[in-house]
Interface confidence: low
Amino acid sequence: SAPGEDEECGRVRDFVAKLANNTHQHVFDDLRGSVSLSWVGDSTGVILVLTTFHVPLVIMTFGQSKLYRSEDYGKNFKDITDLINNTFIRTEFGMAIGPENSGKVVLTAEVSGGSRGGRIFRSSDFAKNFVQTDLPFHPLTQMMYSPQNSDYLLALSTENGLWVSKNFGGKWEEIHKAVCLAKWGSDNTIFFTTYANGSCKADLGALELWRTSDLGKSFKTIGVKIYSFGLGGRFLFASVMADKDTTRRIHVSTDQGDTWSMAQLPSVGQEQFYSILAANDDMVFMHVDEPGDTGFGTIFTSDDRGIVYSKSLDRHLYTTTGGETDFTNVTSLRGVYITSVLSEDNSIQTMITFDQGGRWTHLRKPENSECDATAKNKNECSLHIHASYSISQKLNVPMAPLSEPNAVGIVIAHGSVGDAISVMVPDVYISDDGGYSWTKMLEGPHYYTILDSGGIIVAIEHSSRPINVIKFSTDEGQCWQTYTFTRDPIYFTGLASEPGARSMNISIWGFTESFLTSQWVSYTIDFKDILERNCEEKDYTIWLAHSTDPEDYEDGCILGYKEQFLRLRKSSVCQNGRDYVVTKQPSICLCSLEDFLCDFGYYRPENDSKCVEQPELKGHDLEFCLYGREEHLTTNGYRKIPGDKCQGGVNPVREVKDLKKKCTSNFLSPEKQNSKSN
């Protein structure tokens, strides 16, 4: 039988009455245009909604926008457009919400053509009040807050000037001209690229990378011949043009650009690209595009310095610069990532790693599913997940995979079961163990969200017809109840719940259409009365993450340690609550070969834990560049996985000797850097 329709599914008692008392409708007095929604702060209940509508007139487009505020998680909204003097707000800049719980908001207004500069509205009290400020420039980008100090803002102007404010946008100063890209680093540092000749595009590959650590009083050039740069974890990356040709290489710095090392990655040509797929303070996943318009490349994983890389996955699907990749960090379980590969026959298959890129496998076939027409063998196939690429191809996939750090082990995604991703209408699958096992959760495409740290899952069917039914589950997707939230169906446009999955409120957004008009409408449903009581100790059970063989002493060991979690029992219908903290008990494991990646010049044959020398490097000295000096590597082929905490056990030899020789490649060496003050 279909999920949720077998005899074992107990109904939640009196849920219709409980939900009806907690369903709040708000009709927005707006013509349907576009709507954007932002949460202001964490656990504040404050939501800002900006609606915009363009009226095409004969000579020009006249726009109007309205701003609404809720302070009860979307149950009620108040029109606060008068606080911004009924000004038309530019949606392409969105609402710039300050970091953490600063309560800061910046809205960028539309101004008439001849004005000297732009205009912003600023609030530092969770949008209770706004101050209008006229800018001395026209902004090109949204205001960017410093992660360390929300009073510090930076923005680029349409004239390519870099502007900084130290008092939350009250006063602005242009600290540099001819700027292409600017980013906040740590400790209020700003990194930016500049062009010398004509424009960012014309100077691509000849840009300079600059740094200021004092908001523009002084500067240091930390790189030349730059194509682009990026920040990930504690790493600063720059792709740098080679001296002799049009290829470029990645250089990496862990000291804010004072010293650079060349990453041991292939160089790329004009049509290729590098992409940082994921980065933390331990390591980096880097995609390197294949030559030619193949649509795939190779994933490499770094060591703890971001310098030495190991090949992690071949034929990784990534469709051109800024294109689509399915690479997904499963945030509900440490070490788990999902992505897609393009196989030789051009079909797309999903792969999963449980050990941060050490080994990739197919997803196990769900117990309650048949193999589809893509499968050669009807009894042997895998689950394939739809993510960004499928969405970009306009497949019937309304949402990417979903996981939340505080809903331990839960992953929800659209998928198909066969030898490859199918273009047929997908179903929704759930894993409760971080991707090891999967179950079909819902027939057909749905929108879904996680509430109360996994205590409730909510779903709405994806349909082009108006809808008025929401589905919810209190047992991690095993059984489903349906609730009709309105008599009059609406054209559904989105589910909104507070980021972090701690809330018990869900907002259903859509529009109503009658003969002459259409209006935005939201329904906010509070599930607090469904989960009547707070969870107690007896509601939780001990769960060993990454467990595949309970008989094995090392069962659950991933990246050198195992973790036991307290998980809510599926049968318990209770509130985790807003203050819920994931309880976990780590224990260190003995080192095995699984705790080591293959070192530079080595690789792991399929289904083997031993690293063997790359044939083309056999007998060669292993030399690489570090901080512009040549190093000699003595290794028996292994290096510890960054972040791996294992102790004892296997201990392969690894030694790096300084050859005291200069590297001959094009480095961002200290002598190529200079400083200046304003």
């Epitope: 576009s34 095409p56 191809q393 497949l395 019937n396 047929m424 082009s464 054209y491 446009t493």
Partner: antibody, heavy 129, light 107 residues
């Protein structure tokens, strides 16, 4: 009112290129996609590709890949379709059609397929030696 | 690509009668389907989108139904201005594809 006005008829020799324009008026040019569809004499409709006027991104039918280029000029609210290496079988009427359900369309329409709701009058392209 | 097959190729109907046109997709297109009407020398005109929703200004005698792979356009009572060629089109998966068309002629 919303309308699409296309450039006039063209006669081309095999191997040449043709560039057809389509000027939009009466709506926000960047708020939907624009498809190009052709119809050979006495035949049915054939979709060639689509362009997003907002960002200029395109998607072409495999059959025309490498021969067709769709561009736009937001300052004049005009989209262009250029077809190169013309052959006699490219003789057809070429239509531009607004396709408001493109992914970048503003507002709720982007979730559903709303059809090609406004069409240009068509441009006849004749390829003959 | 998804192949759209329309039947019949020609339908002869008397004015005032009901006309039923079929469109079949080679794989599911959900409800991402539109119907168009085209008269000689004119551009196509959108009749139905989302498989069943009438476009602005389209008379109530036109109705669409179906989802997945089987779709129907029904003209409840044919008027003289309804004699034309009708095309279905899917937008479930690129490239968008049209059916071969059904010509509705006067009996």
């Amino acid at each position: 009112q919303v309308q699409l006005v296309q450039s006039g008829a063209e006669v081309k020799k095999p191997g040449a290129s043709v560039k057809v324009s389509c000027k939009a008026s009466g709506y926000t040019f960047t708020s939907g996609y624009m498809s190009w569809v052709r119809q050979a004499p006495g035949q049915g409709l054939e979709w060639m590709g689509i362009i997003n006027p907002y960002g200029g991104t395109t998607s072409y039918a495999q059959k025309f890949q490498g021969r067709v280029t769709m561009t736009r000029d937001t300052s004049t609210s005009t989209v262009y379709m250029e077809l190169s290496s013309l052959r006699s079988e490219d003789t057809a009427v070429y239509y531009c059609a607004r396709d408001p359900s493109g992914i970048a369309a503003a507002g709720p329409a982007s979730r559903y397929y709303y059809g090609m709701d406004v069409w240009g009058q068509g441009t006849t392209v004749t390829v003959s030696s | 690509e998804i192949v759209m097959t329309q039947s019949p190729a020609t339908l002869s109907v008397s004015p005032g009668e009901r006309a039923t046109l079929s469109c079949r997709a080679s794989q599911s297109v959900s409800s991402n389907l539109a119907w168009y009407q085209q008269k000689p020398g004119q551009a196509p005109r959108l009749l139905i989108y989302g498989a069943s929703t009438r476009a602005t200004g389209i008379p109530a005698r036109f109705s669409g139904s179906g989802s997945g792979t089987e779709f129907t356009l029904t003209i409840s009572s044919l008027q003289s201005e309804d004699f034309a060629v009708y095309y279905c089109q899917q937008a479930r998966l690129g490239p968008w594809t049209f059916g071969g068309g059904t010509k509705v002629e006067i009996k």
